[in-house]
Structure formats: C-alpha cells, structure tokens
C-alpha cells in the first residue's frame, strides 16, 4: 500500500481541519487507514481520524480540533494497520479555508433595490469574524451570458444592487463565498445558491 499524493490539509480556523490525499490504488479508506494527529504541546494526546473515501483512490479525513491559535502545530501520521505510510506536520493557521457563509437571502420588497444578506459563518469571538470579505456571484439561468461577481470588501454581510441593472421578468441566482485577507486564506466554498424572480419595472416616464 502506497501514498500517491501526500495529505494536504486546510483548517476552518474553528473546529475542523480537512485533510485529503490519494492512494496508489483503490482503497477502502475507512477500513484500511487511520490518520493520527497530535498537537505539539505539553501533555497532549494522540487523536485518531477515520478517513472516508473521496473517489476511487482518494481519501478525506475531518480532524476535530479545539479552537485554533497561531502557535498550534500538529504532527500527522498516516497508518495502514501497523505500517506507517506517511509522516508530516500541519500548522492550521497557515492553511486556512474559511467556512462558507450561510443563510443567503434576497429581499426584493425594497424599492428599486435588490438586497442580498447572508450570515458570517463565525462567532464574534473567532479571529476571522472581523476579517472576512466576500464575493457575491449573480447569474441568470434565462440569460447564460449574464454572470457577475460583486466584491464586498466591507464587513457588513450585505449587498445592494439597483434592480434596474437586472433584466425584468427573468429569474436570477446568487451565491456567496468568503476569504480572510490578514490570514492569507483561500476562498471558502460557495454558499448554497438562492433564486429570485426580478419583477422590477422602470417607471413609465423612464421607459
């Protein structure tokens, strides 16, 4: 049994780090492999993660952690029974992928404006809470040529779009993702998308 692609891990900077790797051949990850992890810290214990399959040769493991701080460093050991397949280390603060924003809602009852709101995925006491900026993707299923990215660089998880900039009488979808500038993170996954119908019509005298 051999590791083809070494484990690569990202942290949500809250409670979970996700490690993915590829094996040299088809593997029943949960039955054959264990990923052991241990914080390099006084009296810390070794913890075990049972991986899941992620495609035929891919494995993924969700490491449960306490809150993350910048000093944290983990040793990682990938075992197949009594055989050590790979040994490495992982510093969560240097490999952060934020959680996806949630509760994306579209408010169309505001005059002349489409208001999108969503929730910050972190609690206020988390370091990422005040560091997230967002990208909102809006597209139309009726108009394949229409797709826009709106960068939200302020802290408030809202975006206002003049309804007049969207075509009337067709449906739109929106989704949002996040990243944290000062932690040099990757982008989060996209939130689930939400759909709305743009019924806005310009006043008669502006037509």
């Amino acid at each position: 049994m051999k590791v083809l692609q070494e484990p690569a891990c990202v942290s949500d900077y809250m409670s979970i780090s996700t490690c993915e790797w590829k094996m040299g051949g088809p593997t029943n990850c949960s039955a054959e492999l264990r990923l052991l992890y241990q914080l390099v810290f006084q009296s810390s214990e070794t913890h075990t993660c049972v991986p899941e399959n992620n495609g035929g040769v891919g494995c993924v493991c969700h490491l449960l952690m306490d809150d993350v701080v910048s000093m944290d460093n983990y040793t990682l050991d990938l075992w197949a029974g009594q055989q050590l397949l790979w040994k490495g280390s992982f510093k969560p603060s240097e490999h952060v992928k934020p959680r996806a924003p949630g509760n994306l809602t579209v408010h169309t009852n505001v005059s002349d404006t489409v208001l999108l709101t969503w929730s910050n995925p972190y609690p206020p006491d988390n370091y990422l809470y005040n560091d997230l900026t967002y990208a909102v993707n809006i597209w139309s299923e009726n108009d394949p040529a229409y797709s826009r990215i709106h960068n939200v660089t302020y802290l408030k998880p809202t975006l206002r779009i003049p309804a007049s900039t969207l075509k009337s009488g067709i449906s739109y979808r929106a989704r949002v993702r996040a990243w944290a500038q000062h932690y040099n993170t990757t982008w989060s996954e996209w939130s689930p998308s939400t759909k709305w119908y743009n019924s806005y019509r310009e006043p008669f005298e502006q037509r």
Epitope: L39, Q42, S43, S44, E45, T46, V69, D72
Partner: antibody
Framework: EVQLVESGGGLEQPGGSLRLSCAGS????????MTWVRQAPGKGLEWVSS????????YYADSVKGRFTISRDNSKNTLYLQMNSLRAEDTAVYYC??????????????????WGQGTTVTVSS | DIVMTQSPLSLPVTPGEPASISCRSS???????????VDWYLQKSGQSPQLLIY???KRASGVPDRFSGSGSGTDFTLKISRVEAEDVGFYYC?????????FGQGTKLEIK
C-alpha cells in the same frame, strides 16, 4: 471532594529504591495529566515528572531521568513514582498534583489545582 | 530550561496594606492571546502549596478577590490589594508552558 493522597515515603539508603503512590478521588482521573513536585528541607519547589492522562506522554527533570519512573493505573485512579538509585539529594517532601485536562485536542490548563498532603522521602546511610 | 526570577525574596507588610510580587521569565510564556502559562502558588507553613492564579490572571476557585495576577510575555505580577494575617507564607511563580516546569525561588511574605 477532589482529593489526592500520597503514600510510600520513608527512610532509604543511598542506592536504594522506593515507590510512591498517589490515589485520586472526586474527579475523572484518566482525563487529567498528573505531576510530581518535590521540596527539599528548607528549599523551594522543584518539578520532578509529569504524565498525560493516557500515560502515553511522560516527562522528567534531568536530575531524575534514568532513575525515576512515573506511571499511572487509571483503573485504580492511582499515580506512581518508582524511585531507583536514590541519592542524598533526593531527600524531600514529594507532592503529587492534578495537572491539565489532557483528553481535549489542546489540553485545558487550570493550574496545578489540587495537591496531595505530601510524603517524606529521606535518603541517608 | 526557562528560568523564573522572583523579587523581592522577602516582603514584610502591614496588615491592610497592598503587596506586590514580581516574576520574570527567561523566555516568553504567551502561547496565544490571553494564555500566559504562568501560575502563582502560596505555601503556608507546614502545608502543601495551593493554587492562587493560573494562566497569568485567572483566579483559582475559592481564592479571595484581593489576589490578582497580571502581566504578559516575560513579566508577571501578583498583587494582594489588602494583606491579611492569614496570607503569610511563601509565594511561588511557576511556568507550565513546557517541561521542565520551573518555579521562582519563592517570596516570603511576613507581617510587620
């Protein structure tokens, strides 16, 4: 009530051996690291050894490394310190203390918040 | 090893007056914000040590609020706002960031 009770101290000749015990009660013993601290007559406190809750991680002061062995029996809620090749400078009151909660991924530290009453070890010919 | 240096080593205090003990470490004891791995212990005559303050500034259960800890990094202070007769004994700071845990030399607090 959370309590630690040491036993096993006594008078021993240089080169001899003693085994100290520390019985814990009133808390989930296996979840916590444990520590031994000693105090020579008229002197300050000196850390001796620590062990994680599972017993997998063990630490010693240089002054006792290779001579003392810390261990625990979680089924008996008891911590041990096996002391071999004793020297005159090992003469001290030995205290066991409850250390950090070590079952969490990052051990939770609340200080050495419970101490035993101490057991006296005298090494003399 | 981390060296812990306490001062003063002797502290005569009038009851009702404040007292302050300093502890300096040879390297930083801050692991993360709010987590300085330094404790303060009081050992009264003929007794086991008892925990007063842990993680730099957190008061242990049952410890009177006249005891407080402060500081960060390498410089730490234990303050007693109003000393009482029962506070006499030896005060020790200790670092537990890494083994070997190390103690200060101890400060003897006595009543004038």
């Amino acid at each position: 009530e959370v309590q630690l009770v040491e036993s096993g101290g006594g008078l021993e000749q240089p080169g001899g051996s003693l085994r100290l015990s520390c019985a814990g009660s009133g808390f989930t013993f296996r979840d916590f690291a444990m520590t031994w601290v000693r105090q020579a007559p008229g002197k300050g406190l000196e850390w001796v050894s620590s062990i994680s809750g599972s017993g997998d991680n063990i630490y010693y002061a240089d002054s006792v490394k290779g001579r003392f062995t810390i261990s625990r029996d979680n089924s008996k809620n008891t911590l041990y310190l096996q002391m071999n090749s004793l020297r005159a400078e090992d003469t001290a009151v030995y205290y066991c203390a409850k250390d950090r909660l070590s079952v969490t991924v990052r051990p939770r530290y609340y200080g050495l918040d419970v101490w035993g009453q101490g057991t006296t070890v005298t090494v003399s010919s | 090893d981390i060296v812990m240096t306490q001062s003063p080593l002797s502290l005569p205090v009038t009851p009702g007056e404040p007292a302050s003990i300093s502890c300096r470490s040879s390297q930083g004891l801050l692991y993360s914000i709010g987590y300085n791995y330094v404790d303060w212990y009081l050992q009264k005559s003929g007794q086991s040590p008892q925990l007063l303050i842990y993680l730099g500034n957190k008061r242990a259960s049952g410890v009177p609020d006249r005891f407080s800890g402060s500081g960060s990094g390498t410089d730490f202070t234990l303050k007693i706002s109003r000393v009482e007769a029962e506070d006499v004994g030896f005060y020790y700071c200790m670092q537990s960031l890494q083994t070997p845990y190390t103690f200060g030399q101890g400060t003897k607090l006595e009543i004038k």
